[in-house]
Interface confidence: low
């Protein structure tokens, strides 16, 4: 995967909200819930009032991307899904605001959001070849593909 | 099952320190923020301080905050509350309480000791 | 951070009453709320959370409703075993804050 440096030179200013209270789920139909402090895993629901509720923040880039760059909180929380490594899971990061400018190795909390029809794709700013991606019996993680599930539903307005 | 006790209260002079200790047993207390929750003599409950399931963050309430602290020992499955100058309106009954699965730390309590009490001497 | 008030403070009722308890945010918490139920001499236990998701094994009499600031406990037919004191609990924010507590008493 792309070491951090390789967009370290890149800065990333926060423009708004794009998204509130939405819900991710899985191609097997799994939404995404809340492990423990740290983490996030994936599990069929059958009351969709247990998963994860996310807002979607937006970015612009200083090299003008084409690719709409955002950064995720749970909502009503200060909490924002940080990336790590390959076949690492993602972290729940506590910061007091959402930052404002992120550059650098800050970039592990940006993701390039990319979409196919219904499917969602969240592809990490720090490792370009990775993605946000479910796995069976493991936390929420950056994966390259399968056997990892890469491509997410929005669900939105389930309150 | 899961279980949690406290111990270490007793009766201590004002501006004085008392160290409560909480011990987990029955799940792994590792994967879980816990927390101090207090009631005084006939009043209600007051939420004290919590720490994040790997000690890294720490919240308290603004009556404690500067005097207390709160900390864990994953490895022993212990929950700690260093109470430093104390204060006679620091009478309570302490407990240690643990949120449910899948939540982080702003966490509804499901878990709950009997509780350590805290008085003084006059 | 935020307050939450409780009403009334205590109320009286008989087996049998349907019995209704209030909690107001000082501010909007979504569906952040939880309630409990302790008896003298013991630790609280969990009701209610998410506003109206019942804790295992807690009977159906018991349910909560509301959202954003103003939230209901209800006990639809009140049995002996639930005199008691009710804490609401709002779970929104880091810093967390109970009510007051309302006593439920014999009439």
């Known amino acids: 995967s792309a070491p951090f440096s390789f967009l370290s030179n890149v800065k990333y200013n926060f423009m708004r909200i794009i998204k509130y209270e939405f819900i991710l789920n899985d191609a097997l139909n799994q939404s995404i819930i809340r492990a423990n402090d740290q983490y996030l895993t994936a599990a069929a629901l059958h009351n969709l009032d247990e998963a994860v509720k996310f807002d979607m923040g937006a970015y612009k880039s200083s090299k003008d991307d084409a690719k709409i760059t955002v950064i995720l909180r749970i909502s009503k929380t200060q909490l924002y899904v940080t990336a790590q490594d390959e076949d690492q899971p993602v972290l729940l990061k506590e910061m007091p605001e959402i930052p404002k400018t992120i550059t650098g190795s800050e970039t592990n909390l940006l993701f390039f959001w990319e979409t196919h029809g219904t499917k969602n794709y969240f592809t990490s700013v720090a490792h370009p070849n990775l993605f946000i991606a479910t796995k069976q019996d493991y936390w929420v993680c950056l994966a390259g593909g399968p056997p990892s599930i890469t491509d997410f539903q929005i669900l939105e307005n389930q309150a | 099952q899961v279980q949690l006790v406290e111990s270490g209260g007793g009766v201590v002079q004002p501006g004085r320190s008392l160290r409560l200790s909480c011990t987990a047993s029955g799940f792994t207390f590792s994967m879980f923020g816990v927390h101090w929750v207090r009631q005084a003599p006939g009043k209600g409950l007051e939420w004290v301080a919590a720490v994040s399931y790997d000690g890294s963050n720490k919240y308290y309430a603004e009556s404690v905050k500067g005097r207390f602290t709160i900390s864990r020992d994953n490895s022993k499955n212990i929950l700690f509350l260093q109470m430093d100058s104390l204060r006679l309106e620091d009478t309570a009954v302490y407990y240690c309480?643990?949120?449910?699965?899948?939540?982080?730390?702003?966490?509804?309590?499901?878990?709950w000791g009997q509780g350590t009490l805290v008085t003084f001497s006059s | 951070d935020i307050q939450m008030t409780q009403s009334p403070s205590s109320v009286s009722a008989s087996v049998g009453d349907r019995v209704t308890i209030t909690c107001r945010a000082s501010?909007?918490?979504?569906?952040?709320l939880a309630w409990y139920q302790q008896k003298p001499g013991k630790a609280p236990k969990l009701l209610i959370y998410?506003?109206?998701n019942l804790e295992t094994g807690v009977p159906s009499r018991f349910s909560g409703s509301g959202s954003g600031s103003d939230f209901t406990l209800t006990i639809s037919s009140l049995q002996p075993e639930d005199f008691a004191t009710y804490y609401c609990q709002q779970t929104s924010s880091f810093l967390l804050s109970f009510g007051g507590g309302t006593k439920v008493e014999h009439r």
């Open positions: 309480a643990r949120g449910r699965p899948k939540v982080v730390i702003p966490a509804p309590l499901a878990h």
């Open positions: 998410e506003a109206s």
């Open positions: 501010q909007g918490i979504s569906s952040w």
